[in-house]
């Protein structure tokens, strides 16, 4: 089992039902990571969230809501190029043991047809800790708006830690960021999934240290091919 999921700081509760594709990956009853519903059978998350078995929470912004769907999943497929050391290609597909029931609160995320440019305003969401290094886990889904940062500007911060398929987002001089428990969750820009929470500086919320995301637009072929292959 990998490190517990990563990382919302300086955010606010999401508007109810505004993120119907958002899921939580639970280990037993405990939050492990975030994720997104790609279709009735598949959840997309970060590769570093891998476990042997998952309980997937869908359909409610509140963890522990009895009206939520809870579906077990025992098969997951990491991107073959994932590195535990560098977190390059940090994405994974999780196959649900039974189909999710789509509704107004459970919807498929829109995968990107293009990569959004730097400066685009996006929303990152999750049930991860709202304080760091001391942890405070909310029961309600939290959201924060951040802007995409160019690879050139992000490399100035993270230098050799940054790889090609990584996407950076943040707000200058702000603490706004994802944090422990948010990993694998969505960064949504103009209605499409552009990023999955991957990593950032610990403690979370260091000003001018952006959050780092897996750039989903670079992986749509792998996502579709993998779902087809393991139908």
């Amino acid at each position: 089992e990998e490190a517990q999921g990563d990382k919302i700081i300086d955010g606010a509760p999401c508007a109810r039902g505004s993120h119907p594709w958002q899921v939580a990956l639970l280990s037993g009853n405990q939050l492990h990571c975030g994720g997104v519903l790609v279709n009735e059978r598949w959840v997309l998350t970060a590769a570093h969230c891998k476990m042997n078995e998952y309980t997937v929470h869908l359909g409610s912004d509140t963890l522990g809501d009895r009206r939520a769907q809870r579906i077990k999943a025992s098969k997951s497929f990491r991107h073959p190029g994932y590195s535990t050391q560098t977190h390059v290609n940090d994405l994974m597909l999780v196959k649900l043991n039974s189909q999710a029931r789509l509704s107004s609160m459970v919807k498929k995320v829109r995968l990107p047809s293009r990569c959004e440019p730097p400066g685009t305003t996006c929303t990152v969401s999750g049930w991860g800790t709202t304080t760091s290094p001391d942890v405070t886990f909310p029961s309600d889904l939290m959201c924060v708006d951040v802007k995409l940062i160019s690879p050139q500007d992000c490399t100035k911060v993270y230098k050799d830690l940054l790889e090609n398929s990584m996407l950076c987002a943040g707000i200058p001089d702000s603490k706004k960021n994802a944090c422990n428990g948010d990993s694998g969750g969505p960064l949504v820009c103009r209605g499409t999934l552009q990023g999955l929470v991957s990593w950032g500086t610990f403690p979370c919320g260091q000003p001018n240290d952006p959050g780092v995301y897996t750039q989903v637009c670079k992986f749509t072929k792998w996502i579709n091919d993998t779902m087809k292959k393991h139908r």
């Epitope: 490190a3 990563d6 977190h87 993270y158 950032g200 610990f202 979370c204 260091q206 000003p207 001018n208």
Partner: antibody, heavy 122, light 107 residues
Framework: QVQLQESGPGLVKPSQTLSLTCTVS??????????WNWIRQHPGKGLEWIGS???????YYNPSLKSRVTISVDTSKNQFSLKLSSVTAADTAVYYC??????????????WGQGTLVTVSS | DIQMTQSPSSLSASVGDRVTITCQAS??????LNWYQQKPGKAPKLLIY???NLETGVPSRFSGSGSGTDFTFTISSLQPEDIATYYC?????????FGGGTKVEIK
């Protein structure tokens, strides 16, 4: 290859302030994703984390020492410093400066200075 | 603070022996557990990070396992150059804390 070098007096009188500086070469102290730490080791004993500083200037201290510790950074000189006030003989130790990878996913000390022995005695 | 209990505090083994050191955390630290080797008069050196990942350049006879509260460090075949004190360290929460150390000697 990142290298760290501690400097400062090896002897400090009780009640005075211990001051050490760490000079970093082969890497920038203003790189994100890393913390710059002070760790000490009492003679023949284990390791104790004192505190850390980030490129942003944010600091985190061990609660057991917090009231006496100040860590600061000078990015222009690629240095960070430790001040420990009101020292007693119990502060006699080898003091290490160290770089840690400080990510939400990985956290570990990857580079250490060679350590400097500071003795508190009158 | 998270307490780290390491055992044994010292051990003596022959060259070629398998050596095992355990480390227990006072609360769940997921896999935020690192192992360091310290030789007399030297600074510690990172061997294993995230409980089981071998640091670049470290011989493969060193390994680590565990998650949650219980962790194990193993030297599969003890070599003379492995005489040192080994420390576990939790990195789940601040302050980072270390185990008391295990001194490894050759019989």
């Amino acid at each position: 290859q990142v290298q760290l070098q501690e400097s400062g007096p090896g002897l400090v009188k009780p009640s005075q302030t211990l001051s050490l500086t760490c000079t970093v070469s082969g890497g920038s102290i203003s790189s994100g994703g890393y913390s710059w730490n002070w760790i000490r080791q009492h003679p023949g004993k284990g390791l104790e984390w004192i505190g850390s500083i980030y490129r942003s200037g944010s600091t985190y201290y061990n609660p057991s020492l917090k009231s006496r510790v100040t860590i600061s950074v000078d990015t222009s000189k690629n240095q960070f410093s430790l001040k420990l006030s009101s020292v007693t003989a119990a502060d006699t130790a080898v003091y290490y400066c160290a770089r840690a990878k400080a990510l939400t996913t990985h956290r570990y000390v990857d580079y250490w200075g060679q350590g400097t022995l500071v003795t508190v005695s009158s | 603070d998270i307490q780290m209990t390491q055992s044994p505090s010292s051990l003596s083994a022959s060259v070629g022996d398998r050596v095992t050191i355990t480390c227990q955390a006072s609360q769940d630290i997921a896999n935020y557990l690192n192992w360091y080797q310290q030789k007399p008069g030297k600074a510690p050196k990172l061997l294993i990070y995230d409980a089981s990942n071998l640091e670049t350049g470290v011989p493969s006879r060193f390994s680590g396992s565990g998650s949650g509260t219980d962790f194990t460090f193993t030297i599969s075949s003890l070599q003379p150059e492995d005489i040192a004190t080994y420390y576990c360290q939790q990195a789940r929460d601040l302050p980072f804390t270390f185990g008391g150390g295990t001194k490894v000697e050759i019989k």
